[in-house]
């Protein structure tokens, strides 16, 4: 392993079509990839009028987006299906939504809003 | 090596039924999904359905619901595809197929195909 | 069920040329869009997963993007070995279903 680097061999599993895929609603699921490879974990949820529903969770794979966050948190403004990824083991227990904000100008010294956490 | 092989080509009557294995090597099975792939000639990719072994219950593509049956067999890491009053429609080439992950990103190992030809 | 439309259906092109393939879904399968490549006789082979990750061993010419409905796969600097038929895949709601294929043919 790479120092510094969180290996991530497992990642909490969910799926919410789980009657419709006949697999289990929730559970581990260990995370296989090339050895050259990175492993990540994920989560994708909706927001249906404020309300959290969370739609997978599982593994994800050696994707340049997912490298070196330790938390899981979607940056997107808006979108219609959140995603976030993340390294190390379960770290999709825990997601959060955290929109990056156009830069602009700030007419005073700007504050960072703590982001909201999902689990 | 990772790979997936299966059985060999089959020659089956209209109204019988078809049972192809695939045996799997180099990677754990029983927490790997399984997904079974078939491709008519000259024709396009159809999903027909897959398991997780240790969950043990299969998913089924609607149109296939009743007349396929997918199995494994954990101690041999053999996967099985089981289609019924079989038609001239079934003719086709039938893959089976790891997946990446339970979430189905995508199908990375591909056995090396099993034709199934259905005539009278 | 998610229906995937490809464009174009085939499509002739020179070595070192760069192609673009689009994949359009009926419903937003979100990231859960892959790209497989086949060549006659053989079983198909994923290049992309997750709509831009690459899979193992696949040279970094293929690229893949989009998000929502609207996906593309870009081969730049087109080699003699690419010369084949890609399909598109959503595997985000059962059941999964295919893209009817684009054959790239050699100019």
């Known amino acids: 392993a790479i120092l510094g680097r969180s290996e991530t061999q497992e990642c909490l599993f969910f799926n919410a079509n789980w009657e419709k895929d006949r697999t289990n609603q929730t559970g581990v699921e260990p995370c296989y990839g090339d050895k050259d490879k990175r492993r990540h974990c994920f989560a994708t949820w909706k927001n249906i009028s404020g309300s959290i529903e969370i739609v997978k969770q599982g593994c994800w794979l050696d994707d340049i987006n997912c490298y070196d966050r330790t938390d899981c948190v979607e940056k997107k403004d808006s979108p219609e299906v959140y995603f976030c990824c993340c390294e190390g083991n379960m770290c999709n227990e825990k997601f959060s939504y955290f929109p990056e904000m156009e830069v602009t100008q700030p007419t005073s010294n700007p504050v960072t809003p703590k982001p909201p956490y999902y689990n | 090596q990772v790979q997936l092989v299966q059985s060999g080509a089959e020659v089956k009557k209209p109204g019988s039924s078809v049972k192809v294995s695939c045996k799997a090597s180099?990677?754990?099975?029983?927490?790997?999904?399984i997904s079974w792939v078939r491709q008519a000639p000259g024709q396009g990719l159809e999903w027909m359905g897959g398991?997780?072994?240790?969950?043990?219950?299969?998913n089924y593509a609607q149109k296939f619901q009743g007349r396929v049956t997918i199995t494994a067999d954990e101690s041999t890491s053999t996967a099985y595809m089981e289609l019924s009053s079989l038609r001239s429609e079934d003719t086709a080439v039938y893959y089976c197929?790891?997946?990446?992950?339970?979430?189905?990103?995508?199908?990375?190992?591909w056995g090396q195909g099993t034709m199934v030809t259905v005539s009278s | 069920e998610i229906v995937m439309t490809q464009s174009p259906s085939s499509l002739s092109a020179s070595v070192g040329d760069t192609v673009t393939i689009t994949c359009r879904a009926s419903?937003?399968?979100?990231?859960?869009l892959a790209w497989y490549q086949q060549k006659p006789g053989k079983a198909p082979r994923l290049l992309i997963y997750?709509?831009?990750p690459l899979s193992s061993g696949v040279p970094s010419r293929f690229s893949g993007s989009g998000s929502g409905t609207h996906f593309t796969l870009t081969i730049s600097s087109l080699q003699p070995e690419d010369f084949a038929t890609y399909f598109c895949?959503?595997?985000?709601?059962?059941?999964?279903?295919f893209g009817p294929g684009t054959k790239l043919e050699i100019k």
């Open positions: 398991l997780i072994p240790i969950f043990g219950t299969a």
């Open positions: 895949q959503q595997s985000y709601s059962t059941p999964f279903t």
């Open positions: 197929v790891k997946d990446l992950t339970w979430t189905n990103l995508g199908l990375d190992i």
């Open positions: 997750g709509a831009s």
């Open positions: 419903q937003g399968p979100s990231r859960w």
């Open positions: 180099g990677f754990q099975f029983r927490t790997s999904l």
